[in-house]
Interface confidence: medium
């Protein structure tokens, strides 16, 4: 279930997945929540004297058991991901941080009169992920009232340093507050020939679009269908970017589908989860567990309740079925997407709904009887 | 190209511009189309920037200033640098680029013929070097593709001009005794082509030189005929790997 408590002066030992910089424990928890494998995190609010570069370190962790040994560490804050916390799930982070310089690649600098104006500039710039504002009291006069728009490959600061009279914060695109607009177009049989930032395996262009929406540097995508001529690229979703923020003119290409990230949308922002169950499809990945259930919906529910499960395959093959139901293989991968997709008539596959804001469940707290 | 003249669109349809997109986008090297999915260039172009995803390849282009963020380009799927290439020497300066998606051939974008292994001793008389590189040693990249005709220089003679370096049989030299016409910085990886028996052949890949267009200092090129087996083997093994990694 949902574990939202934080543990002060506690550090989880082992289970390291990734380390990033975040300005506070709440943001670290958010990053853990949306990381495909992170279940636990430890954040260093204070650094030991010998390790100043570890201050603001957010250490994302995983564990087969869902827990890790706790050690006492002054200034550390630890907790759980909110992957199973329904209504508490939100990528939006509106806090601003006084006296912090969140560092990254500075790609734009302009004069603004307030922090709010700077945050708005960032929210309305396609490339901006976070910002730093120098107040009128900043020690270098030439930078006073300057708004620095920043980005990084991870979407999080490359380092964080305490600096007087600097204020930092994040873009509010994930809060659906961007005014950039939201191109919903899907281009059938067109490919974008822009710079690839990553690639994942997805069953269709809509999952590809959602993956793009939640990737820190994806602006648009091209998905190659199962009919695409190059076998190794079938069902591959190429996440793309460009300097201008817009794709180059698409190339006509049969069995390619292209479109845009929806991260600047105000109303049509998708949830970071995929409801659809794909019949005749098998998702490959690292095997977590196998149970026997009745129906693909029940398999999806089992996957959703199993916190480490990212996707599943339900098999109706005779050898995979017995009295209590058919085989439900719970799976995971490093990026949360299948490592390969194959087409099998007797299989059905889908994703965990653990990151959906409202997870429909048959376990209702109040049963309403029909009259 | 030092001492060259402007080319016209479609005159050298195999010529591509290899550009790097880091903070800004810049032309770095030339290259030659040798197949729908294959570009031949110099290995040394990738020293310092060995990351395939930052390279953009533009074909069918005459004027680099007309490239905008809407201009289509090709991305690198696979970068194959000669296994014996070491940046700390001038030898084996050859690389193959496999493109993410095959090129559509047009009158402005099509391949150049490779010589055969038997052409290692062929005497070529009508040879041209092309590129967007500097027009003088301390110059700058040119917008319009430049061309220059240039005579080949026998290796023994070339070695005499380069007492400080070793000119191997896998290199071919071209230049005028009096200097004045040569490839230069930014032309690396581009083609040295010769018309022989009525068709253009890729004889050399622009590699290095002592400055540019200096008297008694010819340009040094990778001799393509010496690498035919390597080129064919790499293209073939890439096709076989693609079959091995494809889903059942």
């Amino acid at each position: 279930g949902c574990l939202s408590q934080l543990y002060a002066n506690t550090f989880f030992r082992g289970g390291d997945l990734a380390a990033i910089y975040t300005p506070d424990a709440q943001h670290c928890q958010k990053m853990c929540t949306f990381h495909p494998r992170c279940l636990l995190f430890s954040f260093l609010a204070v650094s030991p004297t010998k390790e100043t570069d570890k201050r603001f370190g957010c250490f994302m962790k995983e564990s087969i058991t869902g827990t890790l040994p706790r050690i006492h560490r002054t200034g550390a804050i630890s907790g759980h991901s909110l992957k199973q916390c329904g209504h508490q799930l939100s990528a939006c982070h509106q806090d601003i941080y006084e006296g912090l310089d969140m560092r990254g690649s500075n790609f734009n600098i302009s004069k603004t009169d307030s922090i709010e104006e700077c945050q708005k500039l960032c929210t309305n710039n396609i490339h901006c992920q976070f910002f730093t504002y120098a107040t009128k009291a900043f020690h270098r006069p030439e930078y006073r009232k300057s708004c620095l728009l920043k980005r990084s490959s991870s979407g999080t600061p490359t380092s964080i340093k305490p600096v007087d009279n600097l204020v930092s914060g994040f873009s509010l695109k994930s809060c659906a507050l961007s005014e950039i607009g939201c191109p919903m177009d899907i281009f059938q049989h067109f490919a974008f020939a822009d710079l690839n930032v990553s690639q994942v395996v997805t069953p269709d262009a809509f999952v590809c679009r959602t993956v793009c929406t939640f990737h820190p540097n994806c602006l648009f995508f091209t998905f190659y269908t199962n009919e695409w001529e190059t076998e190794s690229q079938r069902n591959v979703c190429f996440l793309k970017t460009s300097k201008s923020g817009r794709p180059s003119p698409p190339i006509i290409q049969e069995n390619a589908v292209s479109g845009y990230s929806l991260f600047t949308c105000r109303k049509a922002r998708p949830e970071p989860c995929h409801f659809k169950i794909y019949s005749g499809v098998a998702f490959e990945g690292e095997e977590l567990n196998a149970t026997f259930v009745q129906g693909a919906d029940a398999c999806q529910e089992t996957c959703t309740k199993t916190i480490r499960c990212q996707f599943f395959t339900y098999s109706l093959l005779p050898q995979d079925c017995k009295a209590e139901g058919c085989k439900c293989s719970l799976r995971l991968s490093t990026d949360g997407s299948p490592t390969r997709i194959t087409y099998e008539a007797q299989g059905s596959s889908g994703y965990s709904l653990r990151l959906c804001k409202v997870v429909e469940s048959s376990d209702c707290t109040t049963k309403i009887n029909a009259r | 190209i030092v001492g060259g003249t402007n080319s016209s669109l479609g005159e050298w349809p195999w010529q591509v511009s290899l550009q790097v997109k880091l903070v800004s986008q810049n032309h770095m090297c030339g290259g030659s189309i040798i197949g729908r999915q294959w570009i031949l260039t110099a290995a040394h172009c990738f020293d310092g920037i060995p990351y395939p995803d930052v390279w953009r390849i533009y074909g069918g282009i005459l004027n680099l200033s007309e490239i905008t963020n809407k201009t289509p380009f090709s991305s690198i799927k696979e970068l194959i640098i000669h296994q014996k290439y070491k940046m700390s020497e001038g030898s084996y300066d050859i690389a193959l680029i496999k493109l993410q998606t095959p090129l559509n051939y047009t009158e402005f974008q099509k391949p150049i013929c490779l010589p055969s292994k038997a052409d290692t001793n062929t005497i070529y008389t009508n040879c041209w070097v092309t590129g967007w590189g500097y027009t003088k040693e301390r110059g700058e990249t040119q917008n319009i593709l430049q061309k220059a005709t240039i005579p080949l220089v026998p290796n023994e003679e070339c070695q005499k001009k380069y007492r400080d370096y070793v000119i191997t049989k896998q290199m071919i030299c071209a230049g005028y005794k009096e200097g004045g016409i040569d490839a230069c910085k930014g032309d690396s990886g581009g083609p040295l082509v010769c018309k022989h028996s009525g068709r253009w052949q890729l004889v050399g890949i622009t590699s290095w030189g002592e400055g540019c267009a200096r008297k008694e200092q010819p340009g040094v090129y990778t001799k393509v005929a010496e690498y035919i087996d390597w080129i064919l083997e790499k293209i073939q093994s890439s096709k076989e790997r693609a079959l091995e990694t494809s889903p059942a």
């Epitope: - | 770095m28 090297c29 040394h44 172009c45 020293d47 310092g48 920037i49 060995p50 940046m87 700390s88 020497e89 001038g90 300066d93 590189g133 007492r163 400080d164 370096y165 070793v166 490839a183 230069c184 910085k185 930014g186 032309d187 690396s188 622009t206 590699s207 290095w208 030189g209 002592e210 540019c212 040094v220």
Partner: antibody
Framework: EVQLLESGGGLVQPGGSLRLSCAAS????????MIWVRQAPGKGLEWVSY????????TYADSVKGRFTISRDNSKNTLYLQMNSLRAEDTAVYYC???????????????????WGQGTLVTVSS | DIQMTQSPSSLSAFVGDRVTITCRAS??????LNWYHQKPGKAPKLLIY???RLQSGVPSRLSGSGFGTDFTLTISSLQPEDFGNYYC?????????FGGGTKVEIR
């Protein structure tokens, strides 16, 4: 094994001269560019001069131009630095180093220093 | 002349720490950037040439990166023998210039 051994350093008065030698072994000396680099006491490194394999081309730092001459004798596998009109600011440990070839953007240059001698101290003082 | 600015000028770190030294050129130098290590009373030793190429015999815990004006030398896990001075050097154009050096001390 590549070895470079400097000699000829010592105490000299301002305006005086010295000739440094660098004996090379363990590699084909005539195929490599050679370099002199110096380091004043407690200070950083300063490139002084450079000579091509054949000895046909030499280059100098502005601070020594016209006063120092680099030369080589490929038959003796030896590099030299003739230092004239010495000044107090020339006081330093002088290192000879071998230049490695680097090919980049159609330029083939000898410009990193892959093997160094142990150095010889030159003191210019009255 | 091209100025090479190294930072920090000195640092103190524990064995096993990750150490990063940066070098900035006053104008773009492509990848013509080399790194050297010098122990007190000894000659410098080449570590990395052409920004990212490891000289033979140099341990793989050292790595270099960068292009243009900004370069980095990283020691992934500091060892006792890594103390001393580190210098960057541009070889884009004569005069070849060195950075001011970074003194690395083991705590």
């Amino acid at each position: 094994e590549v070895q470079l051994l400097e000699s000829g350093g010592g105490l000299v008065q301002p305006g005086g001269s010295l000739r440094l030698s660098c004996a090379a072994s363990g590699f084909t000396f005539s195929a490599y560019s050679m370099i002199w680099v110096r380091q004043a006491p407690g200070k950083g490194l300063e490139w002084v001069s450079y000579i091509r394999p054949s000895g046909g081309r030499t280059t100098y730092a502005d601070s020594v131009k016209g006063r120092f001459t680099i030369s080589r004798d490929n038959s003796k596998n030896t590099l030299y630095l003739q230092m004239n009109s010495l000044r107090a600011e020339d006081t330093a440990v002088y290192y000879c180093a071998r230049g490695g070839l680097l090919l980049w953007n159609r330029e083939l240059k000898s410009n990193y220093f892959d093997y160094w001698g142990q150095g010889t101290l030159v003191t210019v003082s009255s | 002349d091209i100025q090479m600015t190294q930072s920090p000028s000195s640092l103190s770190a524990f064995v096993g720490d990750r150490v990063t030294i940066t070098c900035r050129a006053s104008q773009p130098i492509d990848n013509y950037l080399n790194w050297y290590h010098q122990k007190p009373g000894k000659a410098p030793k080449l570590l990395i040439y052409a920004a990212s190429r490891l000289q033979s015999g140099v341990p793989s815990r050292l790595s270099g990166s960068g292009f243009g004006t900004d370069f980095t030398l990283t020691i992934s896990s500091l060892q006792p023998e890594d103390f001393g001075n580190y210098y960057c050097q541009q070889s884009y154009t004569v005069p070849y210039t060195f950075g001011g050096g970074t003194k690395v001390e083991i705590r």
